[in-house]
């Protein structure tokens, strides 16, 4: 008889729980040891890395990964074709764009090939695991004597992303931040011409196309003020 242990894996939806199936035995054996949890992230919907902590195994083990999509046309079990390694031991699997179907339930199964009954299955909603590339091409426009507008680009559909802008002056100890919706535009209404400003932006796949919690990396910073604004008072887009 199989026993199923449910433990949350951090993916919000209840259908995305982590199912660990083990076979009970008379004495404690390798088959009762839990397998490491698999963490998947979809990078800009270009590729996906599903990784696990290979060092959590009591002895070096080349765990294998299979995946499929639940209740869909893509429900055929697939073997990982591109493993990631850590110290010559499998520690992840990379899937390419054509293998990523965001809005179908992704099922990933980790298995110990030496103990086939020792396996763990997780169900993930990939639209909640997308991490976009960092924003690019930050530009600043001076709309008036005291107003600046920051624009940027993303290598993704604008309406799928929300953004976080941070800015500070050389006199500030901490960043001021402002959320920005899919329109990827930010205005600072009151700029002190005597100060040097630094801006940076990051983006997240939320809330219109998914419910991802993870932000992109920060963009390269862009600077404005005192020693730079004299060079071109209306446009400055040099990345540091």
């Amino acid at each position: 008889l199989n026993t199923t242990i449910l433990t949350p894996n951090g993916n919000e939806d209840t259908t995305a729980d982590f199912f660990l199936t083990t076979m009970p035995t008379d004495s404690l054996s390798v088959s009762t040891l839990p397998l490491p949890e698999v963490q998947c992230f979809v990078f800009n919907v270009e590729y996906m890395n599903c990784t696990w902590n290979s060092s959590s195994e009591p002895q070096p083990t080349n765990l294998t990964l299979h995946y499929w999509y639940k209740n869909s046309d893509n429900d055929k079990v697939q073997k990982c074709s591109h493993y990631l390694f850590s110290e010559e031991i499998t520690s992840g699997c990379q899937l390419q764009k054509k293998e990523i179907h965001l809005y179908q339930t992704f099922v990933v199964q980790l298995q110990d090939p030496r103990e086939p009954r020792r396996q763990a299955t997780q169900m993930l909603k990939l639209q909640n695991l997308v991490i976009p590339w960092a924003p690019e091409n930050l530009t600043l426009h001076k709309l008036s004597e005291s107003q600046l507008e920051l624009n940027w680009n993303n290598r993704f559909l604008n309406h799928c992303l929300e953004h976080l802008v941070q800015y500070r002056t050389d006199w500030d100890h901490s960043w001021t931040e402002q959320s920005v919706d899919y329109r990827h535009k930010f205005s600072l209404p009151s700029v002190d011409g005597q100060k040097r400003y630094t801006f940076r932006v990051r983006s997240r796949f939320n809330p219109l196309c998914g419910s991802a919690q993870h932000w992109s990396e920060w963009s390269h910073p862009i600077h404005w003020g005192s020693n730079t604004s004299k060079e071109n008072p209306f446009l400055f887009a040099l990345e540091a």
């Epitope: 965001l102 809005y103 179908q104 559909l157 604008n158 899919y182 809330p207 219109l208 196309c209 419910s211």
Partner: antibody
């Protein structure tokens, strides 16, 4: 089989509000957007807005932003479109249509609900 | 808002003809272009999504091409059931917008 079934025709007076429902079945409701598109008599298609059923986020065309509200009841897989301050030019067939977010088109449509605004 | 302009507005053709409808976007929409067919009194039906991908169940005589701002829907050999109104639709930028439609009539 995917089905979107809309509520019946409505006749309203100018200034009133109308609430049209769209009940979905045959697919995982929360993986989709639901769009609302209207078509005035003899005219083309006009996108009003959409709601992401996986989280409830909405977006509206500027023209409708102050008058339209999209809501969803995930327990019954039903989406609602409420349009307020009706005027005669709102007379149209209103469609709900689902699409997966990202780059997919609207692959299933409701049968349409005729809303007539007349004094 | 992105304007979608279809041409021609109406078109007469015969069964067996090859027909092309064009759609121009007022700014770059990459490949985020869909095509729909609508018959009188009916809801629209998706034909092509993401510029050239055929929706399931749509006959292979329908095809889409183009990129950026200029797109084309081609029907390689018109069938009697193809006489309808066709709309292009951009899914690149909110608000999503439709072309004004092309009415395809029997000659």
């Amino acid at each position: 089989e995917v089905q979107l079934v809309q509520s019946g025709a409505e006749v309203k007076k100018p200034g009133a509000s109308v609430k049209v429902s769209c009940k979905a079945s045959g697919y995982t409701f929360t993986s989709y957007w639901m769009h609302w598109v209207r078509q005035a008599p003899g005219q083309g298609l006009e996108w009003m807005g959409h709601i992401y059923l996986g989280g409830g986020a909405t977006n509206y065309a500027e023209k409708f932003r102050s008058r339209v509200t999209l809501t969803a009841d995930t327990s019954t897989s039903t989406v609602y479109m409420e349009l307020s301050s009706l005027r005669s030019e709102d007379t149209a067939v209103y469609y709900c249509a689902r699409s997966q977010p990202y780059y997919y088109g609207m692959d299933s449509w409701g049968q349409g609900t005729t809303v007539t605004v007349s004094s | 808002d992105i304007q979608m302009t279809q041409s021609p507005s109406s078109l007469s053709a015969s069964v067996g003809d090859r027909v092309t409808i064009t759609c121009r976007a007022s700014q770059d929409i990459s490949n985020y272009l869909n095509w729909y067919q609508q018959k009188p009194g009916k809801a629209p039906k998706l034909l092509i999504y993401y510029k050239s991908r055929l929706h399931s169940g749509v006959p292979s005589r329908f095809s889409g091409s183009g990129s950026g701002t200029d797109f084309t829907l081609t029907i390689s050999s018109l069938q009697p059931e193809d006489f309808a109104t066709y709309y292009c639709h951009q899914g690149h930028t909110i608000p999503f917008t439709f072309g004004q439609g092309t009415k395809l009539e029997i000659k």
